[in-house]
C-alpha cells in the first residue's frame, strides 16, 4: 500500500507520458490523477514503466473502479493486463469481441494464463454461448481452446459455430468431447455433398456412431489410417471386413502396421479369419473358421 503524500510543486501530471518513468512510486501515486490515467490508458503501452510503477498504476485504477474496470479502460490495458489477477478480472463485464482480441494479443504466442482463462470464461458466460466469431477468435489465439472445455461447456456451442473449427483445433480432444461435437458437426455440414462433407466431418469422426461409419463406407471416402485410429472402438467393432475395406479404400493396407493397436486389434478379434484373409494383408487373430459367434450383449438386451 502506497502512502498518501502531497504531490510536489510542478510535478502534477498533465498527461501520461514518458516523463513519468522518472517518478518515484509515491510521486506517481500522488501526482497522477486516476481519471487521467483511465482516459489515456493506451499510452501506457508505449512507456517503459518498471514493474513497481505498473503496480502503482494498477492500484490507482483499482481505487477509481472498485467494482471493476469499464470496458473502455479494459480494451486499452495492454501489458498492464498481465498485472491483473483472476480475482480482478472476475469483476469485469467484457462484451466486445474487440476488447477480447486486444487482451488476447497481449498474451499471444504463450500458453493460456489464469488471467486469460478467466477473461475468456467471463466473456463466453456473458454471451451465453460460444458463437462463431468468438470461437474463430479463440481458436486463432489458442488452437487447443475447444478441447480445454468440458463436454457440458461444449454443449453450448451452436452447430453454426462448427464452421470456424479447424482440424488442428481438435487435436487434443478426447472421445467424450468429440461425442458432443460430432452431432453438431453433422448438423452443420448436412447440406454438403459427399466428398466435401467428408473433408469437413473427418476431424470430428472420433465421435461418430457405427451407423454413420457404415453410411460413410458406401461413399468411397478413402479414410486415412490416422483418422481410422481415432474412431471410437465401440463404433468400429460392429463393422464388417467389407465395410472397413470400403471405408479405407486404398488405405486398407495400413491396417497391417496397426494390427496391435486399438481399435484395429479389437476389431480383428471380432472378425472371422476367413474374412480377414480376403484382404490379403496377413492379418491374424480373427475367429477361427467353424466357430460360432454369440453376441451375448445383444441376447441380454433382448431378454
Amino acid at each position: 500500500e502506497v502512502e498518501k503524500t502531497a504531490c510536489p510543486s510542478g510535478k502534477k501530471a498533465r498527461e501520461i507520458d514518458e516523463s513519468l518513468i522518472f517518478y518515484k512510486k509515491w510521486e506517481l501515486e500522488a501526482c497522477v490523477d486516476a481519471a487521467l490515467l483511465a482516459t489515456q490508458m493506451d499510452r501506457v503501452n508505449a512507456i517503459p514503466f518498471t514493474y513497481e510503477q505498473l503496480d502503482v498504476l494498477k492500484h490507482k485504477l483499482d481505487e477509481l473502479y472498485p467494482q471493476g474496470y469499464p470496458e473502455s479502460v479494459i480494451q486499452h490495458l495492454g501489458y498492464l493486463f498481465l498485472k491483473m489477477s483472476p480475482e480482478d478480472i472476475r469483476k469485469w463485464n467484457v462484451t466486445s469481441l474487440e476488447t477480447l482480441k486486444a487482451l488476447l494479443e497481449v498474451n499471444k504466442g504463450h500458453e493460456m494464463s489464469p488471467q486469460v482463462a478467466t477473461l475468456i470464461d467471463r466473456f463466453v458466460k456473458g454471451r451465453g454461448q460460444l458463437d462463431k466469431d468468438t470461437l474463430d477468435t479463440l481458436t486463432a489465439f489458442y488452437p487447443g481452446y475447444l478441447c480445454s472445455l468440458s463436454p457440458e461447456e461444449l454443449s453450448s456451442v451452436p452447430p453454426s459455430s462448427i464452421w470456424a473449427v479447424r482440424p488442428q483445433d481438435l487435436d487434443t480432444c478426447d472421445p467424450r468431447q468429440l461425442d458432443v461435437l460430432y452431432p453438431k458437426a453433422r448438423l452443420a455440414f448436412q447440406n454438403m455433398n459427399g466428398s466435401e462433407y467428408f473433408v469437413k466431418i473427418q476431424s470430428f469422426l472420433g465421435g461418430a456412431p457405427t451407423e454413420d461409419l457404415k453410411a460413410l463406407s458406401q461413399q468411397n471416402v478413402s479414410m486415412d489410417l490416422a483418422t481410422f485410429m481415432k474412431l471410437r472402438t465401440d463404433a468400429v467393432l460392429p463393422l464388417t471386413v467389407a465395410e472397413v475395406q470400403k471405408l479405407l479404400g486404398p488405405h486398407v493396407e495400413g491396417l497391417k502396421a496397426e494390427e496391435r493397436h486399438r481399435p484395429v486389434r479389437d476389431w480383428i478379434l471380432r472378425q472371422r479369419q476367413d474374412d480377414l484373409d480376403t484382404l490379403g494383408l496377413g492379418l491374424q487373430g480373427g475367429i477361427p473358421n467353424g466357430y460360432l459367434v454369440l453376441d451375448l450383449s445383444m441376447q441380454e438386451a433382448l431378454s
Epitope: Y51, L82, H110
Partner: antibody
Amino acid sequence: QVQLVESGGGVVQPGRSLRLSCAASGFTFSSDGMNWVRQAPGKGLEWVAVIWNDGSNKYYADSVKGRFTISRDNSKNTLYLQMNSLRAEDTAVYYCARDRGPLWPLDYWGQGTLVTVSS
Amino acid sequence: DIQMTQSPSTLSASVGDRVTITCRASQSISRWLAWYQQKPGKAPKLLIYKASSLESGVPSRFSGSGSGTEFTLTISNLQPDDFATFYCQQYNAYSRTFGQGTKVEIK
C-alpha cells in the same frame, strides 16, 4: 552495487535434471524482473526465460518450453531455473540477468555457470 | 516469435575507424531494442537501450538509431577496448530475442 551470482552448474547425463540458482544483492530483488540467458560454447546468446517481479508471469523460449521452469524466492533474493529432460543441445553457460520492467533491457548480468549435458 | 538478424557476422576494422552494425527484426518492435557488448569469457554488457539511449557509463562514441524493423549500432572512433562481439536484442512484455552477433576484429 548490483551483484548476481549463479551456481548449480555441472556435468549431467541426457534426460536428467539440474537446478540452477542465482543469488542477488545490491538492489531490491522483489521489485525487478529476472531472466535466464544461455550461451552454447562458441555460439551466440539465447534468451531462455523471464519471471516478473512478483512471480505472477513467466515466459519461456520455445526451445525450453515444457522442460524448464523459472521461479524465484523473494524472501531469499534468489532466482532458480529447474531444468528437466536435459539434452546435449542444452550445454551452455547460463547467465541470470535483471530487467526493471516489461519494456526494459537486461541491465545487469551474472558471470554465468556452465552446464554440460553429456553421457 | 520475433527473429533478429544481424549483419555482418564478422567485421574487420582498425583503431579510429567508424563502424556500423545493422540489426533487422522480423516484425515491428517499435524502439524496444538493446545493444550489448561481450568479450571472451565475460558476461554481456548493456550499451544502448530503447534503440538510441546510451546506458550510464558507456562512452559517447557508441550510438544507436532506428525504429520499427531496422536498427544500427555505430562506433564512431573505434578504440582497442572495443574489439568484441556485439549483440542486438528485442524486448517486450514477455520475450526477448537476440541477434546472432557481430564479431568486430582487428584488421
